[in-house]
């Protein structure tokens, strides 16, 4: 069985999620990469992806999501700026490698966004809200269309564990029904 781990991030509205997904440099440097959300009982949904082939350290922006693929470091950097409560959920990075199925990168990200104080008051109109306005100068890449080859399975359950320290991991064992999403060009 596949052992999946999650890292939990608890942030406030208006803050930035800034994470990395490591990949094997020689194997995947120029492969197209994507940032997906996994909602319970649904297929993973691609929110943003790099260009094809993926360009080195070339920012790709889709709405509030910014992807940067650092080929020389073997990592995909994902930033979600000006977070909203609705952004809460389980996320993952994948590598598109047609005609093969996408390759999932570890670890998954459990994002919890709450209202309230995020360094600067967010709800008070008289105060300065920590909302970063992104200049629309980056590239918006088109992500491949995909479909599930079989019935949608239940996504990993939301953790009820108390994850209070940054080092905490949620270990999901016996997850054999990971959704594989082949790419159709």
């Amino acid at each position: 069985a596949t052992k999946l781990t999650e890292e939990k991030y608890e942030l406030k509205e208006g803050q930035t999620l800034d994470v990395k997904c490591d990949y094997t440099l020689e194997k995947f440097a120029s492969s197209q990469k994507a940032w997906q959300i996994i909602r319970d009982g649904e297929m993973p949904k691609t929110l943003a992806c790099t260009e094809r082939p993926s360009k080195n350290s070339h920012p790709v922006q889709v709405g509030r999501i910014i992807l940067e693929d650092y080929h020389d470091h073997g990592l995909l950097r994902v930033r979600m700026v000006n977070l909203q409560v609705e952004d809460s959920g389980l996320y993952q990075c994948v590598i598109y490698q047609p005609p093969k199925e996408p390759h999932m990168l570890f670890d998954r990200i459990r994002l919890v966004v709450t209202k309230g104080f995020s360094g600067t008051p967010g709800s008070n109109e008289n105060s300065t809200q920590n909302v970063y306005k992104i200049p629309p100068t980056t590239t918006k890449a088109l992500c491949p269309l995909y479909t599930s080859p079989r019935t949608v399975t239940q996504a990993p359950p939301k953790s009820t564990a108390d994850v209070s320290t940054p080092d905490s991991e949620i270990n999901l064992t016996n997850v054999t029904d990971i959704i594989r999403v082949p790419v159709f060009n």
């Epitope: 890292e7 991030y9 942030l11 406030k12 803050q15 930035t16 800034d18 994470v19 990395k20 997904c21 490591d22 094997t24 440099l25 350290s57 910014i66 650092y70 470091h73 073997g74 990592l75 930033r79 700026v81 570890f106 670890d107 990200i109 104080f117 995020s118 360094g119 920590n130 909302v131 970063y132 992104i134 940054p166 080092d167």
Partner: antibody, heavy 121, light 105 residues
Framework: QVQLVQSGAEVKKPGASVKVSCKAS????????IHWVRQAPGQGLEWMGW????????NYAQKFQGRVTMTRDTSISTAYMELSRLRSDDTAVYYC??????????????WGQGTLVTVSS | SYELTQPPSVSVSPGQTASITCSGD??????VSWYQQKPGQSPVLVIY???KRPSGIPERFSGSKSGNTATLTISGTQAMDEADYYC????????FGGGTKLTVL
């Protein structure tokens, strides 16, 4: 608990090389980046680069490109930083530090005790 | 190359509030960390993700960010808080601010 233990102080002559070690314990060594940061006497913190222990890949600050090499020996959970062509202004305390999480590059939650490298003729 | 700017020094009386700023281009879309360093010691993480405190860090330490400026605030400053403080962010590489010497008068 997580610990990073560094090798002892070194005295080197200009033009020589130095190799500092950082032994990790209390966690899975492969899972977290190791960074190297130096601090010259009376100066601030200067990031030198990171090492991905899983792949062995490294990323160096531009200032040190061509002079620094970061490696690891996973069998003994130890990271190394070698700096060559030493100059007197390389005299500094050299720290190794570990990422807080697997999925981030910063912050550095755990630090070694530091290794003083003195470059003098 | 990316730079983070801090004031070289800040002075505060015991019991008062000390504020140390850190500014940088596009800091609004980056997460900021703060470190405390006392003479002869390794740095200690005091704030991460703009405003979170690691366990063991006193509640008097707090962080905030507005636009492209991050602020470390120490309320009810104590003599033991006298140290150098560094901000940090990740651009393409990891960057530290120049450091601020906090003096408790």
């Amino acid at each position: 608990q997580v610990q990073l233990v560094q090798s002892g102080a070194e005295v080197k002559k200009p033009g020589a090389s130095v190799k500092v070690s950082c032994k990790a314990s209390g966690y899975t060594f492969n899972g977290y980046y190791i960074h190297w940061v130096r601090q010259a006497p009376g100066q601030g913190l200067e990031w030198m680069g990171w090492l991905n222990p899983n792949s062995g890949g490294a990323n160096y600050a531009q200032k040190f490109q061509g002079r620094v090499t970061m490696t690891r020996d996973t069998s003994i959970s130890t990271a190394y930083m070698e700096l060559s062509r030493l100059r007197s202004d390389d005299t500094a305390v050299y720290y190794c530090a570990r990422d807080q999480r697997k999925t981030t590059v910063t912050p550095f939650e755990y630090w070694g005790q530091g290794t003083l490298v003195t470059v003098s003729s | 190359s990316y730079e983070l700017t801090q004031p070289p020094s800040v002075s505060v009386s015991p019991g008062q509030t000390a504020s140390i700023t850190c500014s940088g281009d596009k800091l609004g879309e980056r997460q900021v960390s703060w470190y405390q360093q006392k003479p002869g010691q390794s740095p200690v993480l005091v704030i991460y993700q703009d405003n979170k405190r690691p366990s063991g860090i006193p509640e008097r330490f707090s962080g905030s960010k507005s636009g492209n400026t991050a602020t470390l605030t120490i309320s009810g400053t104590q003599a033991m808080d006298e140290a150098d403080y560094y901000c940090q962010a990740w651009d393409r590489n990891v960057v530290f601010g120049g450091g601020t010497k906090l003096t408790v008068l």
